[in-house]
């Protein structure tokens, strides 16, 4: 089932997705799409990275994190009710059927009646758990020609992830409300 995240109309929404690049030079291609992850690729692609860059994006969708260090979390600017729905983060690990697929549900709530001035990157998010694929411990290593070696394992809890991460600082600095549960 999808993990749910929330934002208010007019704010920026944040959908977390992480992995750990195994080698500095070669990132793993990642795609973000609107709609649940299909068998291959992403449907309705809104943003895509390759081995080094963000190489495709559409208006309002961008990566604000250290994407070259594996933080491929998606920011959606100035959301509307139409942005509600399922989003797919797909980490395209070389090899057959090796992709990590995450479905994240974004719920947009109407803005409060008395709007407070919002700062850039303000958002309110519910984080039941953090979706990560980080190299902590044993995992199968896939190698394909000149593509990068990937060493990936999953970690599930937000608390562990936030304890010493930049994200915690970013969230605090942006005035965000974090709910864990």
């Amino acid at each position: 089932s999808e993990v749910e995240y929330r934002a208010e109309v007019g704010q920026n929404a944040y959908l977390p997705c992480f992995y750990t690049p195994a080698a500095p030079g070669n990132l793993v291609p990642v795609c973000w799409g609107k709609g649940a992850c299909p068998v291959f690729e992403c449907g309705n692609v809104v943003l895509r990275t390759d081995e080094r860059d963000v190489n495709y994006w559409t208006s309002r969708y961008w990566l604000n994190g250290d994407f070259r260090k594996g933080d491929v979390s998606l920011t959606i600017e100035n959301v509307t009710l139409a942005d509600s729905g399922i989003y797919c983060c797909r980490i395209q690990i070389p090899g057959i059927m090796n992709d990590e697929k995450f479905n994240l549900k974004l719920v947009i709530k109407p803005a409060k009646v008395t709007p407070a001035p919002t700062r850039q990157r303000d958002f309110t998010a519910a984080f039941p758990r953090m979706l990560t694929t980080r190299g902590h411990g044993p995992a199968e290593t896939q190698t394909l020609g000149s593509l990068p070696d990937i060493n990936l394992t999953q970690i599930s809890t937000l608390a562990n992830e936030l304890r010493d991460s930049r994200l915690a600082n970013d969230l605090r600095d942006s005035g965000a409300t974090i709910r864990i549960g």
Epitope: G25, N26, E51, R52, V54, W57, S146
Partner: antibody, heavy 120, light 107 residues
């Protein structure tokens, strides 16, 4: 210490090709991207493309696609940038620059520059 | 292509001044911006990477700030050796693009 040493100045006629070399030392050549940037006289900086010596992967600025080729020789830790069908507005100083992963692919080391003059 | 705009081509300054050079991206580039210093006849030198990280050996009077589309390089205590051209660059998406440069001059 890290050094990028480029080949000497070139004078070319319109329509000709030029191949600039960049010899790297002081680091593991295959661990870092090599980008190429040029600067026309009195102008700003313009990115031509990059090559990843580890696997030969390249990405070129669309503006130069079909005219530029980047290669490396791992045995000599040397990167090459060839520009074909030269025009007068290709007159510029051409730099190789190391794309540092830990500096988010900004350029932590630059070559001294190679002046390419295109004139009939 | 993402356009990086440095609106001030020249800035007059005096030793000891606080100088702020601005750079605006045509669309969000996160924090993927670098600042370079270039003196006449020399190659550019990296000052700031990832918008606010001072590169090794760069004096702490140089500070970078900003995120998204608006970025600033600040020199807190201008020195004569800081007279140079300054370029911003986005490395979020290729083609990587540079601002047109800002030249610091003495008043």
């Amino acid at each position: 210490q890290v050094q990028l040493v480029q080949s000497g100045a070139e004078v070319k006629k319109p329509g000709a090709s030029v191949k600039v070399s960049c010899k790297a030392s002081g680091y593991t050549f295959t661990d870092y991207y090599m980008d190429w940037v040029r600067q026309a006289p009195g102008q700003g900086l313009e990115w031509l493309g990059y090559i990843y010596p580890n696997n030969g992967g390249t990405s070129y600025n669309q503006k130069f696609k079909g005219r530029v080729t980047m290669t490396t020789d791992k045995s000599t830790s040397t990167a090459y940038m060839e520009l074909r069908s030269l025009r007068s507005d290709d007159t510029a100083v051409y730099y190789c620059a190391r794309g540092g992963y830990y500096s988010y692919y900004s350029y932590d080391y630059w070559g001294q520059g190679t002046t390419v003059t295109v004139s009939s | 292509d993402i356009v990086m705009t440095q609106s001030q081509k020249f800035m007059s300054t005096s030793v000891g001044d606080r100088v702020s050079i601005t750079c605006k991206a045509s669309q969000s580039v996160g924090n993927n911006v670098a600042w370079y210093q270039q003196k006449p006849g020399q190659s550019p030198k990296l000052l700031i990477y990832y918008a606010s990280n001072r590169y090794t050996g760069v004096p702490d009077r140089f500070t970078g700030s900003g995120s998204g589309t608006d970025f600033t390089l600040t020199i807190s205590n201008m020195q004569s050796e800081d007279l140079a051209d300054y370029f911003c660059q986005q490395h979020y998406s290729s083609p990587y693009t540079f601002g047109g440069g800002t030249k610091l001059e003495i008043k």
